[in-house]
């Protein structure tokens, strides 16, 4: 069937970066500026995505592939193919409808995006807290209290929070 189709359909010979031009006797024409075709045999070229406003161009459009956007500094991508840009917050905060808010006690966020998460429950794994959590950092779990030698202190104060911490992805 494929062979028959290629014999009957001249469009199947048009490579990526071209389209099968009905107005010109079905010859393969290059995609016009600001358009692309990523597969062969296409009858039209797709319009290139434009990265405007809070979006910035990560990869320019070519005749065979669409442009790719990311976000300007202070924002991060959300959704497939970076369909949205969301405001960054500081470590130790999360974005709410009212803007960036500090993490509640017992929760942390070590990134500039995402939500405040509860500190890890070390006892879930039979471990103890080795380093206390902060708004910016999770606890670090250590050995179970039974594993500690007598007189050894089990909890270390948290390491001082520093930028940049976990960078936004």
């Amino acid at each position: 069937f494929e062979r028959t189709r290629s014999l009957q359909d001249p469009c199947s010979n048009c490579p990526a970066g071209t389209f099968c031009d009905n107005n010109r006797n079905q010859i393969c024409s290059p995609c016009p500026p600001n358009s692309f075709s990523s597969a062969g045999g296409q009858r039209t070229c797709d319009i290139c995505r434009q990265c405007k406003g809070v979006f910035r161009t990560r990869k320019e459009c070519s005749s065979t592939s669409n442009a790719e956007c990311d976000c300007t500094p202070g924002f991060h991508c959300l959704g497939a193919g970076c369909s949205m840009c969301e405001q960054d917050c500081k470590q130790g905060q999360e974005l709410t409808k009212k803007g960036c808010k500090d993490c509640c006690f017992g929760t942390f966020n070590d990134q500039k995006r995402g939500i405040c998460r509860p500190w890890t429950n070390c006892s879930l794994d039979g471990k103890s807290v080795l380093v206390n959590g902060t708004k910016e950092r999770d606890v670090v779990c250590g050995p179970s209290p039974a594993d500690l030698s007598p007189g050894a202190s089990s909890v270390t104060p948290p390491a001082p929070a520093r930028e940049p911490g976990h960078s936004p992805q």
Epitope: Q111, T120, D138, H166, S167
Partner: antibody, heavy 119, light 107 residues
């Protein structure tokens, strides 16, 4: 005991995709980060990304953002990593790992899955 | 990304020797430094986490020290079963990054 068991070796053609699985047992799957790490032949280790299975929140190494997609199925305690548009440089052993209790270290490693890309 | 400079890339030592490997991150990572052992069969094991904390079940001949941008991993008395490649890894900042590894051989 805590265990991560990965799917078997794969041989794929350039341009194809592959989905590697990592089945967790011996702990509460939703409470720990699962990471994926790449080791190309004769090379060091590279962190690809991770997922928190409870809400499927992911982080990616920018280098692998267009290559890897990490997902998790809570019902089967299994994490997955799909690699797309495979090229010869994707030939490597891929490991899944679990954190030690907080994301900052990786205490349990799967046995590794070899992915070979060859025409 | 934080670069992890690990040295030496390989070393040969005798059973009973004291072996030292260093790891230098390109920026301050506080104490978020871990050490892993990869055996010739490719199995990987966490030995030390948070710079100096020995993972439960790991022999006490393994130790770690340092902070900020200078870290050291030591095997106090090398054993035949310690033949492996050792990696440092920073857990301070995404993306997590590893040193290039130190291949340890017995003389």
């Amino acid at each position: 005991q805590v265990q991560l068991v990965q799917s078997g070796a794969e041989v794929k053609k350039p341009g194809a995709s592959v989905k590697v699985s990592c089945k967790a047992s011996g702990y509460t799957f939703t409470s720990y980060w699962i990471n994926w790490v790449k080791q190309a032949p004769g090379q060091g280790l590279e962190w690809i990304g991770n997922i928190y299975p409870s809400d499927s929140y992911t982080n990616y190494n920018q280098k692998f953002k267009d290559k890897a997609t990490i997902t998790a199925d809570k019902s089967t305690s299994t994490a997955y990593m799909e690699l797309s548009s495979l090229r010869s440089e994707d030939t490597a052993v891929y490991y899944c790992t679990r954190d030690y209790g907080s994301a900052y270290s990786m205490s349990t490693w799967g046995q590794g899955t070899t992915v070979t890309v060859s025409s | 990304d934080i670069q992890m400079t690990q040295s030496p890339s390989s070393l040969s030592a005798s059973v009973g020797d004291r072996v030292t490997i260093t790891c230098r991150p390109s920026q301050d990572i506080s104490n978020y430094l871990n050490w892993y052992q990869q055996k010739p069969d490719k199995t990987v094991k966490l030995l030390i986490y948070y710079t100096s904390r020995l993972r439960s079940g790991v022999p006490s001949r393994f130790s770690g020290s340092g902070s900020g941008t200078d870290f050291t991993f030591t095997i106090s008395s090398l054993q035949p079963e310690d033949i492996a490649t050792y990696f440092c890894q920073q857990g301070d900042t995404l993306p997590y990054t590893f040193g290039q590894g130190t291949k340890l051989e017995i003389k």
